[in-house]
């Protein structure tokens, strides 16, 4: 008599995750008599899968009624997969016996599971960092299998090339991660700016998966300064300003100083927005000229996200301006900010009351 | 350990019935037929039905036709087979047998059940 | 239905001779290359034990000294050399359609 034969025709089968395998085997004789058992993996560390014979297994049946008269399939469908299920499983058949006795191996059939990565998500740097330096972005995606992936970086829809990118675990698994850094350089113009990680993978049609992170949570936009005196007003009293210009975030405390003494300080808040995200800010302080007898010098300290104060400093000529008697003895201190909408409510108004 | 374990002895008067169980252990009970044969004293070895207790699918000896029902309850492993309408010469030995090769043979016998059927 | 007619109805045999009995089939019990004879062993007080299937393939745990052979109608089993254990009534049962059973043979010790 022909010696038995198990046949498992697929070398390897691959099944999205959440759908059902079907897992063939055939056999070549009705002889000897005696059940089959799926494993997977082989050697004395298999895992039973099923036993026709006997055993509880709820996400496993068998394709062909077992009990059908010279029944030689003993194919099974293995459902809702997980990448938990990946590995290579074995048809053995079994001679009748007390206990029955392993006769014969199929060549096995390897499952892969298709399973989509995990959404992306893409993390910045932990603090903050000033336009013209380079920050790191992270993507991470977690679950798919097989292992082949790709993953881009954009900003503002260009791709970025400064990217490292890993996929683990190196050798096979039930399903892998990646993780990609990259090196962005900011400019003054990226507060409105996006970077977007995007993953492809065979499991989504072409459909790829994004991440996205907003280059706002990571820039700083340092201020310009410019401190100017306007034309002497008929009081003797001159009306100094200074422009805080094109910064981001809006929290900024902007201090004036009259040779060097504090006269007021202000907190920006409820700024408009400039169009390409940055704030702007204009504080102005009414000198007294007559209450001075020798030049006053004025400085504009802009504290800006708690970075080191900038200083701008104008000094103010009162030898040319006449003396009153009676006079104030110092400056006035008035000034004013420009108002408008915005997320920063952290000051209140008393900021922009100022006492003489 | 492929086990069958029948119901005792029972004597029964002409014309009532009789309700043979045989509990299976060992294996999967819904993936294998279970025969029942019987043996008059002295006699040989005579095919009733077979059940099929995935599906209750049964095929019957045409002598046995109306007055054996076989049934299965899954849920305990047991199969049964009523034999109505007895008569003197239904005196005999039940056996259920499972069939593991599906082959329509009998692999695995129970020790059987002895009905008497007497006035 | 297919009958079985097993013959001797019974033999006596010398321990350690060769025992053989007869099982016809009144038409062929064939189908897809297989034979679906079995033979079975029933000792007294005791069921019937499968010692053959499918004509000529030993069941697990039956000794080597058994044997079947035959196709179509006709069949054989040989108990090469009879020991004492081996007294008991055979019987051939097909499958080819519904199960039927031979008479049986009954085989003792001469």
């Known amino acids: 008599e022909e010696e038995l034969q198990v046949i498992q025709p697929e070398k390897s089968v691959s099944v999205a995750a959440g759908d059902s395998a079907t897992l063939n085997c055939t056999v070549s004789s009705l002889i000897p008599v005696g059940p089959i058992q799926w494993f997977r993996g082989a050697g004395p560390g298999r895992e039973l899968i099923y036993n026709l014979k006997e055993g509880h297994f709820p996400r496993v049946t068998a394709v062909s009624d077992p009990t059908k008269r010279n029944n030689m399939d003993f194919s099974i469908r293995i459902s809702n997969i997980t990448p938990a299920d990946a590995g290579t499983y074995y048809c053995v058949k079994f001679r009748k016996g007390s206990p029955d006795v392993e006769l014969k191996s199929g060549a096995g059939t390897e499952l892969s599971v298709r399973a989509k990565p995990s959404a992306p998500v893409v993390s910045g740097p932990a603090v903050r960092a000033t336009a013209e330096h380079t920050v790191s972005f992270t993507c991470e995606s977690h679950g798919f299998s097989p292992r082949d992936i790709t993953l881009k970086w954009f900003k503002n829809g260009n791709e970025l090339s400064d990217v490292q990118t890993n996929v683990d675990p190196a050798g096979k698994s039930v399903s892998y991660s990646i993780r990609s850094t990259a090196r962005v350089l900011l400019t003054r113009r990226d507060v409105h700016s996006q970077v977007i990680c995007e993953v492809a993978h065979v499991t989504l049609q072409g459909d790829p998966l994004r991440g996205t992170a907003n280059l706002s949570e990571a820039i700083r936009v340092p201020p310009f300064l410019e401190v100017t005196q306007q034309s002497m007003r008929a009081d003797n009293q001159v009306n100094v300003t200074c422009q805080v210009t094109k910064f981001y975030p809006q929290r900024l405390q902007l201090t004036w100083l009259e040779n060097g003494n504090v006269s007021r300080t202000e907190m920006a808040s409820a700024l408009p927005e400039n169009k390409d995200g940055t704030y702007n800010w204009t504080s102005w302080l009414l000198v007294n000229v007559s209450a001075h007898r020798d030049d006053v010098k004025l400085t504009c300290q802009v504290e800006h996200d708690g970075q080191p104060a900038v200083n701008k400093s104008f000094s103010v000529k009162v030898s040319a301006h006449p003396k009153e008697q009676g006079s104030n003895t110092a400056a006035e201190n008035t000034g004013t900010n420009e108002r408008g909408s915005s997320d920063y409510k952290d000051d209140d108004d008393k900021h922009h009351h100022h006492h003489h | 350990q492929v086990q069958l374990v029948q119901s005792g002895a029972e004597v029964k008067k002409p014309g009532a019935s009789v309700k043979v169980s045989c509990k299976a252990s060992?294996?999967?009970?819904?993936?294998?037929?279970i025969n029942w044969v019987r043996q008059a004293p002295g006699q040989g070895l005579e095919w009733i039905a077979m059940?099929?207790?995935?599906?209750?699918?049964?095929h019957y000896n045409q002598i046995f036709k109306d007055r054996a029902t076989l049934t299965t309850d899954t849920s305990t492993s047991t199969a049964y087979m009523e034999l109505r309408s007895l008569r003197s010469d239904d005196t005999a030995v039940y056996y259920c047998?499972?069939?593991?090769?599906?082959?329509?043979?009998?692999?695995?016998w129970g020790r059987g059940t002895l009905v008497t059927v007497s006035s | 239905d297919i009958v079985l007619t097993q013959s001797p109805d019974s033999l006596a045999v010398s321990l350690g001779e060769r025992a053989t009995i007869n099982c016809r089939a009144s038409?062929?019990?064939?189908?897809?290359?297989?034979?679906?004879i079995f033979w079975y062993q029933q000792k007294p007080g005791q069921p019937p034990k499968l010692l053959i299937y499918?004509?000529?393939n030993l069941d697990s745990g039956v000794p080597d000294r058994f044997s079947g052979s035959g196709s179509g109608t006709d069949f054989t089993l040989t108990i090469s050399s009879l020991q004492a254990e081996d007294v008991a009534v055979y019987y051939c049962?097909?499958?080819?359609?519904?199960?039927?059973f031979g008479q049986g043979t009954k085989l003792e010790i001469k």
């Open positions: 047998a499972m069939d593991y090769g599906s082959l329509y043979a009998m692999d695995y």
């Open positions: 060992g294996y999967t009970f819904t993936n294998y037929w």
């Open positions: 059940i099929d207790p995935s599906d209750s699918e049964t």
């Open positions: 038409k062929s019990v064939s189908s897809s290359g297989y034979n679906y």
């Open positions: 499918l004509a000529s």
């Open positions: 049962q097909e499958s080819r359609e519904l199960p039927t």
